[in-house]
């Protein structure tokens, strides 16, 4: 089944093998003004220098104008994401002009040839924009170019070539191969529009990265770290279809950027927030949930314009499908002491209880070792809005770091069957909500009983708003 890039191996082959594609003429780029949400409506083709189609098709000179730019294709027909995006834009911005840039003839090629064609397509878009600018009331500031995959770099070229500055470019998982590390004039970059926002959903630090890893906009958002998207794993794909393949996984993750953007258009009441962070690991540790100094932003269409001097990398977690929004929490757990822990690494589980709902039992992902007599920071997220948090249930279990350690533990247990139980001592949990920025402190229900052995549970109740406790030193890890 065709995908924007096909499976990784297929793209790798594409980069090297010649491929004959039937094209008898040197075709031009077409601009299809989508005048209806109805996908079967033909729309109108705009023609450079011909004003009549603008009038006949009801082009609104004062309204926002969206140009949707597809990427490389193996099929020569528009994939369904484009239909969804057109429909979502019409729903959200009823008076807007939605133009589909049809460069299928130049995209339905060997990948390397399609890459080489991006410049000429960008130039065609720029010429169309220059011509529109000659019309009364048309403003380049109202133009929003939305490019998917290879189309994101086409948008970059268009923004670079146009006379003046385009209002906004959104890059939806801009293509990686042949663009990673390229000069700013040969790829999408912050200079290409007044505001350039980018969603990265298929980046890989190993193997072939279908999407570009490097930041290329004013804000670069990496949902779920920008690599493995929920609902797109081989297990998910195989589970949902009789004949799943790696191709479907690639398509799912690469195209997820489009669906996140569509979600931001149609689920305005459920905006997803991303948080500035230096890297994915720090985000996974939960230390980047700050909204101070523009450190958080809505993703997709609702992103607030931020023109940073440098690229701003932002992260968030998402659900597996629409609406993608989740609720992020930073959890600070001070482990006061270990007892008889040996080589065992604890894994924590929490259940959050709120005024609206209760969460499932959530594992706390350990990015680094749990430190004793230190504050350990974790990121947890829930798919439902729990409301105001009231209490937390904490459990833990021992997870051996290696088979050798497991054997050591077993041998130790067998030789000393009366070995006293392993325990952790935890007196309080501090929580910060990413979405509300509210900080809360939860204290053990029984202050005299704060030790917890594996499989047992410890309950914490909200004991104060904020984090500062009397006679308490600052936590070891502060928010950015």
């Amino acid at each position: 089944s065709p995908t924007p890039f096909g499976p990784e191996g297929q793209l790798a082959d594409e980069l090297h093998k010649p491929k004959a594609i039937q094209t008898e003429v040197k075709p031009s780029v077409r601009f299809n003004l989508r005048t209806s949400k109805d996908p079967e409506h033909e729309g109108c083709y705009l023609s450079l220098g011909h004003s009549q189609p603008l009038e006949d098709c009801g082009f609104n000179m004062t309204a926002k104008t969206f140009f949707i730019i597809h990427g490389w294709t193996m099929s020569g027909i528009f994939e369904n994401w484009l239909h969804k995006l057109v429909s979502a834009l019409h729903t959200r911005e009823k008076d807007a002009n939605v133009v589909v840039v049809d460069w299928l003839p130049l995209a339905h090629q060997l990948y390397t040839d399609a890459v080489n064609n991006t410049r000429v397509v960008g130039h065609s878009i720029a010429r169309m924009l220059d011509w529109l600018q000659e019309k009364d009331d048309f403003s380049l500031g109202n133009v929003h170019l939305i490019g998917y995959s290879l189309g994101a770099h086409v948008a970059g070229y268009a923004g670079n070539f146009v006379k003046g500055t385009v209002g906004r470019i959104t890059g939806l998982d801009p293509a990686g191969p042949m663009f990673e590390g390229a000069d700013i004039h040969k790829r999408l970059s912050p200079d290409d529009a007044d505001f350039v926002d980018v969603l990265h959903t298929y980046t890989r630090s190993f193997g072939l990265s279908i999407g570009i890893q490097m930041p290329v906009g004013h804000i670069d958002i990496y949902p779920n770290g920008g690599d493995f998207q929920p609902g797109c794993g081989l297990n998910d794909v195989l589970g949902s279809m009789a004949y799943g393949t790696i191709t479907e996984v690639v398509k799912c993750e690469h195209e997820r950027a489009v669906h996140l953007f569509v979600d931001s258009l149609v689920n305005q009441d459920k905006p997803s927030f991303a948080f500035q962070c230096t890297d994915s690991n720090r985000f996974k540790k939960g230390i980047c949930l700050s909204c101070r100094k523009n450190r958080c932003n809505s993703i997709g269409y609702n992103a607030k314009k931020m023109r940073n001097k440098r690229n701003s990398k932002m992260y968030l977690k998402t659900r597996a499908g629409m609406p993608f929004r989740v609720y992020h929490y930073q959890m600070k757990i001070h482990v006061f002491s270990y007892k008889n822990m040996g080589e065992i690494e604890p894994t924590f589980y929490v259940t959050l209880y709120g005024t609206n709902a209760d969460s499932q039992t959530l594992p706390l992902e350990i990015v680094e070792r749990i430190e004793q007599n230190a504050t350990n920071t974790f990121l947890v997220y829930t798919e439902e809005d729990l409301g105001d948090l009231l209490k937390i249930q904490l459990t833990w279990e021992g997870a051996s770091q290696s088979w050798y350690n497991l054997w050591k533990e077993l041998r130790s247990y067998l030789s000393q069957p009366h070995n006293p139980g392993r325990e952790l001592n935890i007196r309080r949990i501090r929580v910060k909500s990413g979405e509300t920025q509210r900080k809360l402190t939860f204290c053990a229900e029984d202050p005299e009983n704060t030790s917890i052995s594996p499989g047992r549970e410890l309950w914490f109740r909200k004991c104060r708003d904020g984090w500062r406790m009397k006679n308490e030193t600052s936590p070891t890890v502060e928010l950015p």
Epitope: N32, S75, G76, L104
Partner: antibody, heavy 120, light 107 residues
Amino acid sequence: QVQLVQSGAEVKKPGASVKVSCKASGYTFTDNTIHWVRQAPGQGLEWMGHINPYYGGTNNNEKFKDRVTMTRDTSISTAYMELSRLRSDDTAVYYCARKGIYYSSPFDYWGQGTTVTVSS
Amino acid sequence: DIQMTQSPSSLSASVGDRVTITCRASQDINNYLNWYQQKPGKAPKLLISYTSKLHSGVPSRFSGSGSGTDFTLTISSLQREDFATYYCQQGNTLPFTFGQGTKLEIK
């Protein structure tokens, strides 16, 4: 009104090739894709592939791989489907159908069908 | 490839009956499901696109519903001209695939 008119019935020997034409009228030929669907006697419908008349780009069902060739002549708004190395199980009615610009678009108009009989 | 399975394969009914034909996809097809009617010796005709959108000129007694992997075509009150074979087709992924058909016969 939209019309797709196909060429007449053909009888071919195994190993030969057949070329079926589909003439479009009533709409702008380059604004929609043309697909080929076949139906063996008493059987269901099977998608063979499509051509984008705007520039001639094609995509075939893997099942037919190198055996099917789709072309078009925009000057006479006609699409062609050639099936080579014919076998007896290629005996079927071959339809051309118009489809919009998306994967999801339905086949909204069909040709009347061309019967191809492969027999020695 | 996505497999499309229709049931029943054949169905006998009388004029005026309410008839339901189901179509199941082997994976989620995002509501990109179309229904066609075919009479003997004729080309298929589009009835319904995008799960539930009636094609122009199709009588309102035809309706479509469903989501994900399970879809239905309903004829609220069967007319004599409705006796034919009905096919579902997915438009989610290449290659496009059809159900095996449901033959609707007069009882």
